[in-house]
């Protein structure tokens, strides 16, 4: 019993003056609280409490359920206690079968004893199964058995309190341990698509998947830079213990341009938070934007290949694509494909493969594409570079020598005179007249140039060379002269 200095309030005294008392079932419990300022007796067992304002607590026929702590309190708030065991061979344990534990914390299996003199007070698995090897426990006859540092693996573990009474093992009613997991990581969040492109009036629906160890994970959809509460629908599943999945679906039934923006799926638990975003772009109508991958003016050498390549953005999906040349549609030689296999892809590639181009195949090649909202096109101007070809080389009646050449780019015609039998015609002769004949004709194809010189200037036998050239190559034609007396005679020209 407690003792204090004289003059100070002292705790009450209890008779019998013991800390513990053992009473046989059916016998009387008689406890007396001795204190001039007596207030009350309280009885506690398994979270149940009873009060008594009489200073003598009497239970005429004690039952096992009268086992517990009896506390007498005085007006100064000081108290003294005695623990009474009511020994009942038929009821060794008092039990509260609800058993919950939090991961990594201790939990109490509430099976206090009614007889403190039994031995081997411990826990046992149900149906003779062993307890987990790492399960540690601490018995206390007045409270029960504490399981130390509960593990997730103990969830739904079936167990009994056990004690040996007169050489026989006695089991309590069964307990099923329910373990609440500790959050040891942030939730795992993912989104059905990272970006959405819609036309006004279309439905926007996006799903966020949240995974965690418990359904007690908080999640919400938020509009960035907005406090407006969004309407979301949930579906959830337990794929097993500690494997929870929630799908939070956000829907805007008829999206508007001003709904465009970033939407965040946010989730948090007691460990921390995680988020993932998706971007919505709402356009008033569809679009097509074409980007040439090469210059739209193309120069290519005769007989070579060229690929006309465009990338284009189309929303909604492109429905018709074609390549056209001179009002004629290509049925082959071209391919069209999406830039990526991503389901949100709006970028496509179209390639027209032109092979062994002829000088006559220059011109405008047009790519046309359309979807349900718009049409778009892009034109490539293809110029085929050709080596000059001398079309005519004649001596005219007026004594002029004339050379006509065609090619692209526009050929230049130079004239040379080779006296006698010399092979090298180095002396250049200035033309009298140069004309581009088809300057006002079609914009593609070969350009025709005509150049003339006056043959009367030549006084000696020799050869006149007409040389037509451009960036691609050169071609020459020759006029042979021979003088017989005073007569000048043109020998047939040759190339």
């Amino acid at each position: 019993q407690p003792s204090v200095s004289p003059g100070e309030p002292s705790p009450p005294s209890i008779h019998p003056a013991k800390s513990e008392l053992i009473v046989r079932v059916g016998n009387e419990i008689r406890l007396l609280c001795i204190d001039p300022g007596f207030v009350k007796w309280t009885f506690e067992i398994l979270d149940e409490t009873n009060e008594n304002k009489q200073n003598e607590w009497i239970t005429e026929k004690a039952e096992a359920t009268n086992t517990g702590k009896y506390t007498c309190t005085n007006k100064h708030g000081l108290s003294s206690s005695i623990y009474v065991f009511v020994r009942d061979p038929a009821k060794l344990f008092l039990v509260d079968r609800s058993l919950y534990g939090k991961e990594d914390n201790d939990t109490l299996v509430r099976c206090p004893l009614t007889d403190p003199e039994v031995t081997s007070y411990s826990l046992k698995g149900c149906q003779g199964k062993p307890l987990p090897k790492d399960l540690r426990f601490v018995p206390d006859p007045k409270a029960g058995i504490t399981i130390k540092s509960v593990k997730r693996a103990y969830h739904r573990l079936c167990l009994h309190c056990s004690a040996d009474q007169e050489g026989k093992s006695v089991l309590s009613d069964k307990f099923i341990l329910k373990v609440r997991p500790a959050f040891k990581a942030v939730p795992v969040v993912s989104v059905s698509k990272a970006s959405y492109l819609l036309r006004e009036g279309e439905e926007f629906t996006v799903t966020c998947t949240i995974k965690d160890v418990s359904s007690s994970v908080y999640s919400t959809w938020k509009r960035e830079n907005s406090q407006t509460k969004l309407q979301e629908k949930y579906n959830s599943w337990h794929h097993g213990d500690f494997n929870y999945e929630r799908q939070a679906t956000l829907t805007i039934s008829s999206a508007r341009v001003n709904d465009s923006g970033v939407f965040m799926c946010y989730a948090n638990n007691t460990f921390g938070s995680a988020n993932v975003t998706t971007t919505l772009e709402v356009v008033d109508k569809g679009f097509i934007n074409i980007f040439p991958m090469i210059n739209t003016t193309v120069f290519v050498n005769d007989g070579e290949n060229v690929d006309l390549i465009v990338e284009y953005e189309a929303f909604p999906k492109p429905e018709h694509q074609q390549w056209i040349y001179m009002n004629r549609t290509f049925t082959d030689k071209w391919e069209d494909y999406p830039k990526s296999e991503n389901e949100s892809n709006i970028r496509y590639v179209s390639e027209l493969h032109l092979t062994r181009l002829k000088g006559t195949e220059g011109g405008t090649y047009t790519f046309l594409v359309s979807n349900s909202d718009v049409n778009a096109s892009i034109a490539f101007n293809v110029y085929v570079n050709t080596k000059p070809e001398i079309l005519t080389y004649d001596r005219l009646v007026n004594g002029m020598l004339q050379c006509v050449a065609a090619g692209f780019p526009e050929p230049t015609i130079d004239w040379y005179f080779c006296p006698g039998t010399e092979q090298r015609c180095s002396a250049s002769v200035l033309p009298v007249d140069v004309q581009t004949l088809n300057a006002s004709g079609p914009p593609f194809g070969k350009l025709v140039v005509q150049s003339s010189i006056d043959s009367s200037a030549f006084k000696h036998n020799g050869t006149v060379e007409c040389k037509a050239y451009n960036d691609v190559g050169k071609t020459s034609a020759y006029f042979n002269f021979a003088f017989k007396g005073n007569n000048k005679e043109q020998i047939h020209p040759h190339t």
């Epitope: 979270d47 149940e48 509260d96 609800s98 609440r180 418990s214 337990h238």
Partner: antibody, heavy 119, light 106 residues
Framework: QVQLVQSGAEVKKPGSSVKVSCKAS????????ISWVRQAPGQGLEWMGG????????NYAQKFQGRVTITADESTSTAYMELSSLRSEDTAVYYC????????????WGRGTLVTVSS | DIQMTQSPSSLSASVGDRVTITCRAS??????LNWYQQKPGKAPKLLIY???SLQSGVPSRFSGSGSGTDFTLTISSLQPEDFATYYC????????FGGGTKVEIK
């Protein structure tokens, strides 16, 4: 033994709200799951939602999302269910029960609170 | 939501009869199925949890079986106090109950 003690019967007008309480006597209230299940006259059982007080996050059945709020006060071991925008079809017995989240079965039930919605 | 379909919705039986009630889930719920008994004016009472585990204090004449989508509650020998309504309940997704089976005296 743990008991769940519910607040008394209520009569409410359509459009109003009702708040029902459920006090747990003893046990480890903070890590219980406390759910609310209702039963309209002559009908079956319908889960409304639940909460584990220690985590403080309530889960709701889709049907009641936005209209029900479940909270818990650890200091008094009491859970609350508030249902707003009441209509006549909300007339039912409202039970609180231990369990119903994270695959817990309902192993302990309150006696129920009759809520009558009538103009 | 996962739909739980109980059958029959009602049955008449005599004391001593063997009674079987079935519950079918609209999708697999593994073994997350519980059975309850409810008497008029009273709260439901847990009988079977996790499809086949008997709740403490429940007589051994009650048993449960099944997994996936099909489950059964069996009362091996019906007693007078067993006349009541029985509900199944799944715990995999948002909790749903079966419509109930009323067991009446023949």
């Amino acid at each position: 033994q743990v008991q769940l003690v519910q607040s008394g019967a209520e009569v409410k007008k359509p459009g109003s709200s009702v708040k029902v309480s459920c006090k747990a006597s003893g046990g480890t209230f903070r890590i219980y799951a406390i759910s609310w299940v209702r039963q309209a006259p002559g009908q079956g059982l319908e889960w409304m939602g639940g909460i584990i007080p220690d985590f403080g996050v309530a889960n709701y059945a889709q049907k009641f999302q936005g209209r029900v709020t479940i909270t818990a006060d650890e200091s008094t071991s009491t859970a609350y269910m508030e249902l707003s925008s009441l209509r006549s079809e909300d007339t039912a017995v409202y039970y609180c029960a231990r369990g119903g989240l994270d695959t817990d079965e309902f192993d302990l039930w309150g006696r129920g609170t009759l809520v009558t919605v009538s103009s | 939501d996962i739909q739980m379909t109980q059958s029959p919705s009602s049955l008449s039986a005599s004391v001593g009869d063997r009674v079987t009630i079935t519950c079918r889930a609209s999708q697999s719920i593994n073994s997350y199925l519980n059975w309850y008994q409810q008497k008029p004016g009273k709260a439901p009472k847990l009988l079977i949890y996790a499809a086949s585990s008997l709740q403490s204090g429940v007589p051994s004449r009650f048993s449960g079986s099944g997994s996936g989508t099909d489950f059964t509650l069996t009362i091996s020998s019906l007693q007078p106090e067993d006349f009541a309504t029985y509900y199944c309940q799944q715990g995999v997704s948002d909790i749903t109950f079966g419509g109930g089976t009323k067991v009446e005296i023949k």
